[in-house]
Interface confidence: low
């Protein structure tokens, strides 16, 4: 049993680490394989992760992280039965991946705009909280070529669209995902997209 | 506003059980632990030990291993502490402390239950 | 388990002047030591955590400072209202542990 892509993890920096690693044969993750992760300060216990199937060969685990401290290191082994078959540190304030933009809705607004809303994932108390900034992606159903990008770092998670800027008639899709530069973060995963239907003559429709 | 708000005080005999509850409001129940903290009367702080309302794992001081017992109600966003076979020195106001995000610090704090033992 | 020793359990002041809090740890914490306040009858306050960052809301007149072992806590120009027990607190391993408390008083 041998690892052929060693555990890459990233971590909420809230509540949730996820490791992925991949094996070089197909595993049944859950039944051959545990990770065992302790936090590096004396005191702290000893947990284990049940890892699940992504794939064949391709094995997740997501450990419960409670109030991750930026110092915070993790040692994490991966064991096969009584097999080590790798060992490492994980840092989780240096491995962010924020939770993925929550609730995203269009809504008419004044002026021929549409208001695209979306909720912040983190609580107002965490750090994470005021250090996102977002990329909205928009783009035409049935014209793969008509597509907007959007960065959005001012602090609201909102964003104001020119109905003007869109075809007119045309299906657009919108999807969310948000960055925390601080922490110089990946990016989350994209929200659900949110359809809707770009007519904006008259307004008085919607 | 984030609030945590705990029962009524209570007043026991000795070898008796008390259950105290922390209602925690205002934020994700499972987001943040809670500690759980002793103070005597006219006493300092001693931190009795957290449970991860993420996972539901305990962690006990060393003093409170035994006859304490943290649990949860993740529905109703309540902590508990259970307190066996009671005695005269467990007489003491217990606090529920939800933990901060970035630091270990404990940064709500319940109103206190004061528990007293006496035959 | 580590021990958190608060060297005053007493200290008095005046209005407006500044006092300091000394709290050392039997071992190195690193920066791992929160700051609290209570005051009688009501529940501890949190106002400094990771030894020097002020917790939401708390005015600029408390600061902290220290690493390691040797941790002080300040309150630079003291008021009326911060008549209260204040504690010192290690998060570094568990169980954490609390320091005796030091009482100010106002003169």
């Known amino acids: 049993v041998k690892v052929l892509h060693e555990p890459s993890c990233f971590s909420d920096y809230i509540s949730t680490s996820v490791c992925q690693w991949k094996m070089d044969h197909p595993t049944n993750c859950s039944a051959e394989l545990r990770l065992s992760y302790q936090l590096d300060f004396m005191g702290s216990e000893n947990h284990t992760c049940v890892p699940e199937n992504r794939e064949d060969s391709v094995c997740v685990c997501s450990m419960p992280i409670d109030d991750a401290v930026e110092a915070d290191v993790y040692q994490l082994d991966l064991w096969a039965g009584q097999q080590l078959l790798w060992s490492g540190s994980f840092q989780p304030s240096k491995h962010v991946k924020p939770r993925t933009p929550g609730n995203l809705t269009v809504h008419p607004n004044i002026s021929h705009t549409w208001l695209l809303m979306w909720t912040n994932p983190y609580p107002t108390e965490n750090h994470l909280h005021s250090e996102l900034t977002y990329m909205v992606n928009v783009s035409n159903d049935n014209d793969p070529e008509d597509f907007k990008v959007y960065n959005v770092t001012y602090m609201g998670p909102t964003l104001r669209l020119a109905a003007s800027t869109l075809k007119s008639g045309a299906s657009y899709s919108a999807r969310v995902r948000a960055w925390a530069q601080t922490y110089n973060s990946t990016w989350s995963d994209w929200s659900p997209s949110t359809t809707w239907l770009n007519y904006y003559e008259p307004w008085e429709q919607h | 506003q984030i609030q945590l708000i705990q029962s009524g005080p209570e007043l026991k005999k000795p070898g008796e059980t008390v259950k105290i509850s922390c209602k925690a409001s205002?934020?994700?129940?499972?987001?943040?632990?809670m500690s759980w903290v002793k103070q005597a009367p006219g006493k300092g702080l001693k931190w009795m030990g957290w449970i991860s309302t993420y996972s539901g794992v305990p962690t006990y001081a060393d003093d409170f291993k035994g006859r304490f017992a943290f649990s949860l109600e993740t529905s109703a966003s309540t902590a508990y502490l259970q307190i066996n076979n009671l005695k005269n020195e467990d007489t003491a106001s217990y606090f529920c402390a939800r933990h901060t995000f970035q630091s270990r610090g404990l940064a709500y704090w319940g109103q206190g239950t004061l528990v007293t033992v006496s035959a | 388990d580590i021990v958190m020793t608060q060297s005053h359990k007493f200290m008095s002041t005046s209005v407006g002047d500044r006092v300091s809090i000394t709290c050392k740890a039997s071992q190195d914490v690193i920066t791992t030591v929160a700051w609290y306040q209570q005051k009688p009858g009501q529940s501890p306050k949190l106002l400094i955590y990771s030894a020097s960052y002020r917790y939401t809301g708390v005015p600029d007149r408390f600061t902290g400072s220290g690493s390691g072992t040797d941790f002080t806590f300040t309150i630079t120009s003291v008021q009326t209202e911060d008549l209260a027990v204040y504690y010192c607190?290690?998060?570094?391993?568990?169980?954490?542990?609390f320091g005796g408390g030091t009482k100010l008083e106002i003169k």
């Open positions: 205002g934020y994700t129940f499972t987001t943040f632990g």
């Open positions: 607190q290690q998060h570094y391993s568990t169980p954490w542990t």
